[in-house]
Interface confidence: low
């Protein structure tokens, strides 16, 4: 904490301006009126204060607003936002999307910090719902935020936001989330040519239906095993041996290493053994020759 000292003669700040960067920490504490700082917060961001000086300014605001800053101040925090703790932010009531955008802009290019996560949580709770503009904003700044949403919330995400999604942003998405995101991605990338389309859609294929996997198998995409292993089991099961071979291309050899894991294991159990043998990989567990194959999928769906 900065020691309380009298402001030297002639140093009392009349404006928040660049002259303040030459003030020592104790001079800032003594000579800058907190109310003046609050009303001219928009100027702080344009002044190259040191981190130590910013600590003093934050301290002054904390004293002025012990119950939490008003939105008029929050909107203009700029880099001072980086000095806030999650505990500070929990005291805020942020309702303006412009305020949210301004603060997210400060953190742009960095991973989502605990401060940002708390800010988003406060904002959404303050609004009472995750409306379309909020979602547009959050996915623009943090594509990875998608996987923290429920499938119901995800259904409100516009396909345009999908363009900003990187493969690693979907690492934490579960199948139910991908089930909602995949058709949006399919729509977003629909005008791309085959190879470019596959590169973009690949991360979302955990939500793809059988029909789309069959279509991809006709396009020489050479899906890697890591992607194949993330496909929905119910989407993979109806694929024929020939379709899987076309889908994986040269990566088909990787099936052997994965034969005990889903969805490969369950898929093998649904194939005729003589069809599996055509792959020459030594996959075992298929339906022996001469056995009748009954499709019980519809009966299961109805029961």
């Amino acid at each position: 904490e900065v020691e309380k000292t009298a402001c030297p003669s002639g140093k009392k700040a009349r404006e928040i301006d660049e002259s303040l960067i030459f003030y020592k920490k104790w001079e800032l504490e003594a000579c800058v009126d907190a109310a003046l700082l609050a009303t001219q917060m928009d100027r702080v961001n344009a002044i190259p204060f040191t981190y130590e000086q910013l600590d003093v300014l934050k301290h002054k605001l904390d004293e002025l607003y012990p119950q939490g800053y008003p939105e008029s101040v929050i909107q203009h925090l700029g880099y001072l936002f980086l000095k806030m703790s999650p505990e500070d932010i929990r005291k805020w009531n942020v309702t303006s999307l412009e305020t949210l955008k301004a603060l997210l802009e400060v953190n742009k290019g960095h991973e989502m910090s605990p401060q940002v996560a708390t800010l988003i949580d406060r904002f959404v709770k303050g609004r009472g719902q995750l409306d379309k503009d909020t979602l547009d904003t959050l996915t623009a700044f943090y594509p990875g935020y998608l996987c923290s949403l429920s499938p119901e919330e995800l259904s409100s995400v516009p396909p345009s936001s999908i363009w900003a999604v990187r493969p690693q942003d979907l690492d934490t998405c579960d199948p139910r989330q991908l089930d909602v995101l995949y058709p949006k991605a399919r729509l977003a990338f629909q005008n791309m040519n085959g190879s470019e389309y596959f590169v973009k859609i690949q991360s979302f294929l955990g939500g793809a239906p059988t029909e789309d996997l069959k279509a991809l198998s006709q396009q020489n995409v050479s899906m890697d095993l890591a992607t194949f292993m993330k496909l929905r089991t119910d989407a993979v099961l109806p694929l024929t041996v020939a379709e899987v071979q076309k889908l994986l291309g040269p990566h088909v050899e990787g099936l052997k290493a994965e034969e005990r894991h889903r969805p490969v294991r369950d898929w093998i159990l649904r194939q005729r053994q003589d069809d599996l043998d055509t792959l020459g990989l030594g996959l075992q567990g298929g339906i022996p020759n001469g056995y009748l194959v009954l499709d019980l999928s519809m009966q299961e769906a109805l029961s």
Partner: antibody, heavy 122, light 106 residues
Framework: EVQLVQSGAEVKEPGASVKVSCKAS????????VHWARQAPGQGLEWMGI????????TYAQKFQGRVTMTRDTPTNTVYMELGSLRPEDTAVYFC???????????????WGQGTLVTVSS | SYELTQPPSVSVSPGQTADITCSGD??????ASWYQQKPGQSPVLVIY???RRPSGIPERFSGSNSGNTATLTISGTQAMDEADYYC?????????FGPGTKVTVL
């Protein structure tokens, strides 16, 4: 051009169930969300529920919870809506509708079936 | 449960502009769609995502949505535009239709 073709008109007694089908012709629709809505004679549209592309997830309007079941038969490109414990006030034209070219966001219903009249009468 | 309100009827002369309103709590925070339905026919989507027109829908149909009100505007209304118009929005995992507005071209 894709069309959604629904099953024919049905007459049912109170307490019975009805199962209406909706089949896509001209293109596969296993990648699209399908809604069901109904319209009582001279009345407005009422949303009943939605089934997702794989058929593993459904959401029903609260009013129909416990009475409606939506299923999907992928090989035949057909979606079904079954409504049980029928009452005279369930007499309506039942529509299936697909969320297609307009985008999956907010699931606007851009392709509609021709409707199936279900009459509930003793 | 979420409710949408529409005027029961709107009358317009040929060539004039018809504005059909749809009101709901914070409707501007949601996406609104509009459907046209003629007697004995299935509904047809004319506007989605507040102001976007599906292919094949004439340019005279436009939409806006802010505050508590979404509006479907038909500019240069034609006789063939006479129909019922329904607004629709998505709220809390549920899809809600308005009661419909009958547009009469005088």
């Amino acid at each position: 051009e894709v069309q959604l073709v629904q099953s024919g008109a049905e007459v049912k007694e109170p307490g019975a169930s009805v199962k209406v089908s909706c089949k896509a012709s001209g293109d596969t629709f296993n990648r699209y969300y399908v809604h069901w809505a109904r319209q009582a004679p001279g009345q407005g549209l009422e949303w009943m529920g939605i089934i997702n592309p794989s058929g593993v997830s459904t959401t029903y309007a609260q009013k129909f919870q416990g009475r409606v079941t939506m299923t999907r038969d992928t090989p035949t490109n057909t979606v079904y809506m079954e409504l049980g414990s029928l009452r005279p006030e369930d007499t309506a034209v039942y529509f299936c509708a697909e969320s297609r070219g307009s985008g999956y966001n907010y699931f606007a219903m851009d392709v509609w079936g021709q409707g199936t009249l279900v009459t509930v009468s003793s | 449960s979420y409710e949408l309100t529409q005027p029961p009827s709107v009358s317009v002369s040929p060539g004039q502009t018809a504005d059909i309103t749809c009101s709901g709590d914070k409707l501007g925070d949601k996406y609104a769609s509009w459907y046209q339905q003629k007697p004995g026919q299935s509904p047809v989507l004319v506007i989605y995502q507040d102001n976007r027109r599906p292919s094949g829908i004439p340019e005279r149909f436009s939409g806006s949505n802010s505050g508590n009100t979404a509006t479907l505007t038909i500019s240069g209304t034609q006789a063939m535009d006479e129909a019922d118009y329904y607004c629709q929005a998505w709220d809390s995992d549920t899809y809600v239709f308005g009661p419909g507005t009958k547009v009469t071209v005088l």
